[in-house]
Interface confidence: low
């Protein structure tokens, strides 16, 4: 480690004095100190002499001697005070720039250590410091404002009491820069735009940042637009806004618009699409099949997507029959807007009743006219079965009627014993009827089919069962002959 002579931590001299500072090390040594006049430097191998014959207040400061070849980087220092009764301060810099939350050193060095008790930091024109300004003082280095804030960007002066009066330093301008987290925040409004040719339109591109130094521009396709910029400071952020006003849009105005903002941290951009159309439009569509089948008692939501410009002037859901004349309850109809020009309309049909099958139409209107989209809703029913004994063309016949939707399939079973339902152990015979006769098949109604089983003689102590099933469920009817002889003849005419 180098050694300084005189071997004291600090030296106090008067203006005009001769000062000699000698540094000796193992190898070559170098001096470092505040830039000030009148010093001469003499180096001789392992020693270096810094001297002046006419010390001034500007020579006040800390002088450090280092040994560049020393791997440990050792150094020695001495602080020199040149106590000028007229000049209590030596200001090393008149502008200090730091980032927010860093410590800001205002380098006003006291020229006389005796004055330390009466020093203070003030804003120019004697104004007090802002509340919550946390600072400390070192006679060797000056005032430090700790964790400086943007609002503390001010002009400061160091004050010292000399013989009952305050003597100020020249001013030091502190610039506290905001730590910019990234590129400016952007908004481009609207996110999408549609206009009919000849209408007016407005596109607003705005950018904001904690720091005023940023640029913003709006471009159409790849052309930068020349738009006057409005500036603002709001909510502790700087805002710059570009507003494009088009009195009468034409097809050449259509296309992609990008709002681009940049600062030292980088660039942000956001885009929107502007569509110019010849006339109003209204398009209805659904992601669902327009022909719907739902089991009775279950619920269904019918959804219609609407794309329209200008906005809708009216819309409603209508039940077109064929059953009751009821209309959908308004509370069951719901509208949501995805964006300005796209909407979804939903009709909720909970716990569907038989009378609610049929056609549901969504109608919408805008200046482009009326449009409608119609759903056909058919209800599914499990089969209902009934069996009767009759004579057809003189033959005893079991007649099974099955009603449901979709069309039921019919199977006959003959089983031993009297039972409500044949089980596998009892089954004697099974007949499938692949083509039962369709008795009725109207839209939105159940399909009724009939199946005939010719039985010459009804066996006593046996059960005849008609089973019907479809995709919803199954139904059955067990026919038990009461007296074998009673049903072998046609009834009396």
């Amino acid at each position: 480690i180098p050694v300084i002579e005189p071997s004291v931590p600090e030296l106090v001299v008067k203006p005009g004095a001769t000062v000699t500072l000698r540094c000796v090390g193992n190898g070559s040594v170098e001096w470092d100190g505040p830039p000030s006049p009148h010093w001469t430097l003499y180096s001789d191998g392992s020693s270096s002499i810094l001297s002046t014959n006419n010390a001034t207040f500007q020579n006040t400061g800390t002088y450090r001697c280092t040994e560049p070849g020393d791997p440990l980087g050792g150094s020695a220092a001495i602080h020199l005070y040149v106590k000028d009764p007229a000049r209590p301060w030596n200001v090393l810099a008149q502008e200090v720039v730091v980032f927010e939350d860093q410590d800001a050193l205002l380098p006003c060095l006291l020229t006389d250590p005796v004055l330390e008790a009466g020093v203070s930091l003030v804003r120019v024109r004697g104004r007090p410091l802002m509340r919550h300004t946390n600072y400390s003082f070192s006679p060797w280095h000056g005032f430090t404002i700790h964790r400086a804030k943007f609002i503390q960007s001010q002009d400061y002066q160091c004050s010292a009491l000399m013989g009952g009066r305050k003597v100020m330093s020249i001013s030091i301008r502190l610039k506290v820069q905001k730590v910019i987290p990234g590129p400016p925040a952007l908004t481009l409004v609207p996110a999408e735009l549609v206009r009919i040719r000849g209408e007016a339109a407005q596109i607003v591109c705005s950018a904001s940042s904690v720091d005023v130094n940023f640029d913003v521009f709006l471009q159409h396709n790849n052309t930068k637009l020349a738009i006057p910029q409005q500036s603002d400071f709001h909510n502790n952020r700087y805002q710059k806004v570009l507003t494009l006003n088009l009195d009468q849009v034409d097809f050449q105005h259509a296309g992609n618009y990008s709002c681009v903002a940049s600062n030292v941290q980088g660039k942000h951009s956001t885009s929107m699409f502007f569509r110019v159309v010849e006339s109003a439009y209204l398009n209805l569509s659904s992601e669902q099949n327009l022909i719907q089948e739902v089991t009775v008692g279950e619920g269904l939501n019918l959804k219609v997507m609407v794309e329209a410009y200008p906005g809708l002037q009216g819309f409603n859901w209508t039940y077109l029959g064929p059953f009751s004349d009821h209309q959908p309850e308004p509370k069951l109809a719901n509208a949501t807007t995805k964006d300005t020009y796209r909407h979804t309309f939903t009709l909720s049909l909970p716990r569907l009743k038989p009378s609610e099958a049929g056609r549901y139409s969504f109608l919408a209107r805008n200046p482009g006219g009326w449009r409608a989209l119609t759903f056909e809703l058919t209800l599914r029913y499990p089969p209902e079965v009934s069996v009767i004994w009759t004579f057809i063309n003189g033959s005893g016949t079991l007649l099974c009627a099955a009603s449901g939707y979709p069309q039921p399939n019919v199977t006959w079973l003959q089983c031993s014993g009297h039972t409500d339902r044949c089980d596998e152990a009892q089954v004697l015979q099974v007949w499938d009827d692949p083509y039962p006769e369709v008795l009725s098949q109207e839209p939105f109604h159940k399909v009724t089919v009939q199946s005939l089983l010719t039985v010459e003689t009804l066996e006593h102590n046996q059960t005849y069962e008609c089973r019907a099933h479809n995709s919803v469920g199954s139904g059955s009817w067990a026919f038990i002959p009461i007296s074998a002889g009673a049903h072998t003849h046609p009834p009396d005419e």
Epitope: M130, S231, D232, H234, V241
Partner: antibody, heavy 126, light 107 residues
Framework: EVTLKESGPALVKPTQTLTLTCTFS??????????VGWIRQPPGKALEWLAN???????YYNPSLKNRLTISKDTSKNQVVLTMTNMDPVDTATYYC??????????????????WGQGTMVTVSS | DIQMTQSPSSLSASVGDRVTITCLAS??????LAWYQKKPGKAPKLLIY???SLQDGVPSRFSGSGSGTDYTLTISSLQPEDFATYYC?????????FGGGTKVEIK
């Protein structure tokens, strides 16, 4: 000429929701830097700031009432609406809307109520 | 929240008197202060903004001063139409807060 006029019910019952409308003319709430605020003054008491809405739809509420207040604007009708839920007799006051003057930038971001409505007296009583 | 303490709460003065009203902020509001005049049954009227700027149309006998936390409204020569209640408002930070008011009455 800048004018603002408050309208709304003169009497509301406790627990009900108060809806006040401020209809203004002489300026537009789409103008950059423009805002409208609501202030109230209970009888014999000081003024109390309630809420502000700015041209860019930025909204600010008094934290002591924030959960009860909603401010919105309809620029096409030149209206600002304030709703206040769960009214209580202590909310009896004259309610004012006021314009927040445009920014004089970049010298300083001035923010002040420069034009006021005449106020509307709202009594909360069962 | 920034508290605004206004004093005095009331004062009696005569026409021609010099009147001073003060507002003390609980923290530095950096001159973001306005003064309003309020008469019974009337809307408040803006007198001073940004601590010392006189609003258009307001007589020059009204002036504002101060910095940091201490602000003053001065009426240099009280006129009959000046008898009213005066309020300060800080808009430095949300929530904006008014002072408690100073009622200027005829002595």
């Amino acid at each position: 000429e800048v004018t603002l006029k408050e309208s709304g019910p003169a009497l509301v019952k406790p627990t009900q929701t108060l809806t006040l409308t401020c209809t203004f003319s002489g300026f537009s709430l789409t103008t950059y830097g423009m805002g409208v605020g609501w202030i109230r003054q209970p009888p014999g008491k000081a003024l109390e700031w309630l809420a502000n809405i700015w041209w860019d739809d930025d909204k600010y509420y008094n934290p002591s009432l924030k959960n009860r207040l909603t401010i919105s604007k309809d620029t096409s009708k030149n209206q600002v609406v304030l709703t206040m839920t769960n009214m209580d007799p202590v909310d009896t006051a004259t309610y004012y809307c006021a314009r927040i003057g445009p920014i004089k930038y970049p010298t300083a971001p001035y923010r002040y109520f420069d034009f006021w409505g005449q106020g509307t007296m709202v009594t909360v009583s069962s | 929240d920034i508290q605004m303490t206004q004093s005095p709460s009331s004062l009696s003065a005569s026409v021609g008197d010099r009147v001073t009203i003060t507002c003390l902020a609980s923290e530095d509001i950096y001159d973001n202060l306005a003064w309003y005049q309020k008469k019974p049954g009337k809307a408040p009227k803006l007198l001073i903004y940004y601590a010392s700027s006189l609003q258009d149309g307001v007589p020059s006998r009204f002036s504002g001063s101060g910095s940091g936390t201490d602000y003053t409204l001065t009426i240099s020569s009280l006129q009959p139409e000046d008898f009213a209640t005066y309020y300060c408002l800080q808009d430095s930070e949300y929530p904006w807060t008014f002072g408690g008011g100073t009622k200027v009455e005829i002595k």
